[in-house]
């Protein structure tokens, strides 16, 4: 019994620096508590972007200062990352852990390459 995690290969952030993607996992057990972590990999450096633990059937709750928001539906998590700039372009990997009841299972997606393009500044207009 393994846990497979699927996520889109590429996502383009909006001009407002918002990127959304779905992280879907095939649960080998009847988990009631799940932890989802988004990791960013760029230039062989890995950083934790955000993490949330949720009870199945309930909403994800990220920390108040988190740049992530999300909703859950069954074995699917809809993640939104805000405040992105061009320098945040990178591979965003979804890590899913089935926390309760035992046994624990780990699943890691292949990553979503998020491209962020900073908007061009508006030219001054003479009126």
């Amino acid at each position: 019994k393994a846990m497979h995690v699927a996520q889109p290969a590429v996502v383009l952030a909006s001009s407002r620096g918002i990127a959304s993607f779905v992280c879907e996992y095939a649960s080998p057990g009847k988990a009631t508590e799940v932890r989802v972590t988004v990791l960013r990999q760029a230039d062989s450096q890995v950083t934790e972007v955000c993490a949330a633990t949720y009870m199945m059937g309930n909403e994800l709750t990220f920390l108040d200062d988190s740049i992530c928001t999300g909703t859950s539906s069954g074995n699917q998590v809809n993640l939104t990352i805000q405040g992105l700039r061009a320098m945040d372009t990178g591979l965003y990997i979804c890590k899913v852990e089935l926390m309760y009841p035992p046994p624990y299972y780990l699943g890691i997606g292949n990553g979503t390459q998020i491209y962020v393009i900073d908007p061009e500044p508006c030219p001054d207009s003479d009126f």
Partner: antibody, heavy 119, light 108 residues
Framework: QVQLVESGGGVVQPGRSLRLSCIAS????????MHWVRQAPGKGLEWVAV????????HYADSVKGRFTISRDNSKNTLYLQMNSLRAEDTAVYYC????????????WGQGTLVTVSS | EIVLTQSPGTLSLSPGERATLSCRAS???????LAWYQQKPGQAPRLLIY???SRATGIPDRFSGSGSGTDFTLTISRLEPEDFAVYYC?????????FGPGTKVDIK
């Protein structure tokens, strides 16, 4: 730099109790699963227990379930292992270990503390 | 529980030689969630490889890991004097997290 320092080991009689502590430094303690791994003299490694992130979820090896309790105090960056009803086969060096970013492998280890259960 | 078997139990080699260590799982280790550790007498284990093939920070490139499913290999391309030690594999895809019994690499 990451540091894990265990304490609390010693000689104890069968059936008695002991509490191990592990003080962590150099990283955000609450962001990592923390584990106890033991090694009997001259033997291999055996995973004992894990306390995940905020401390609410814990998993144990069958060999210690019901006798050992793992806990953590994130405000003190400290991991504990309460060992009750100790047996001779619990004699081992007990290591505190940090789980990795990519999963529960062990990327940093303490120096270990020896627990000897003997009458 | 996933049972890991390591072979050989002892590997006797000379410095400069290539070492090939095997780790076999009783059932498939999902997504190659397998790690390798080195342990020297009187010391704590040290992480070498995670994810079957990713080298941990500060590990020399003479150490490499490969494999998937149930068969994994740790290769030391050219043994240095400090590489003579015991090596353990560990699976971490599901609990309980299990170790192999170890392979001792000693000097011939």
């Amino acid at each position: 730099q990451v540091q894990l320092v265990e304490s609390g080991g010693g000689v104890v009689q069968p059936g008695r109790s002991l509490r191990l502590s592990c003080i962590a430094s150099g990283f955000t303690f609450s962001s990592y699963g923390m584990h106890w791994v033991r090694q009997a003299p001259g033997k291999g490694l055996e995973w004992v227990a894990v306390n995940w992130y905020d401390g609410s979820n814990k998993h144990y090896a069958d060999s210690v379930k019901g006798r050992f309790t793992i806990s953590r105090d994130n405000s003190k960056n400290t991991l504990y292992l309460q060992m009750n009803s100790l047996r001779a086969e619990d004699t081992a060096v007990y290591y505190c270990a940090r789980g990795g970013v990519w999963g529960p492998y062990f990327d940093y280890w303490g120096q270990g503390t020896l627990v000897t259960v003997s009458s | 529980e996933i049972v890991l078997t390591q072979s050989p139990g002892t590997l006797s080699l000379s410095p400069g030689e290539r070492a090939t260590l095997s780790c076999r799982a009783s059932q498939s280790v999902s997504s190659s969630y397998l790690a390798w550790y080195q342990q020297k007498p009187g010391q704590a284990p040290r992480l070498l490889i995670y994810g079957a093939s990713s080298r941990a920070t500060g590990i020399p490139d003479r150490f490499s890991g490969s494999g998937s499913g149930t068969d994994f290999t740790l290769t030391i391309s050219r043994l240095e004097p400090e590489d003579f030690a015991v090596y353990y594999c560990q699976q971490y895809g599901r609990s309980p997290f299990t170790f192999g019994p170890g392979t001792k690499v000693d000097i011939k």
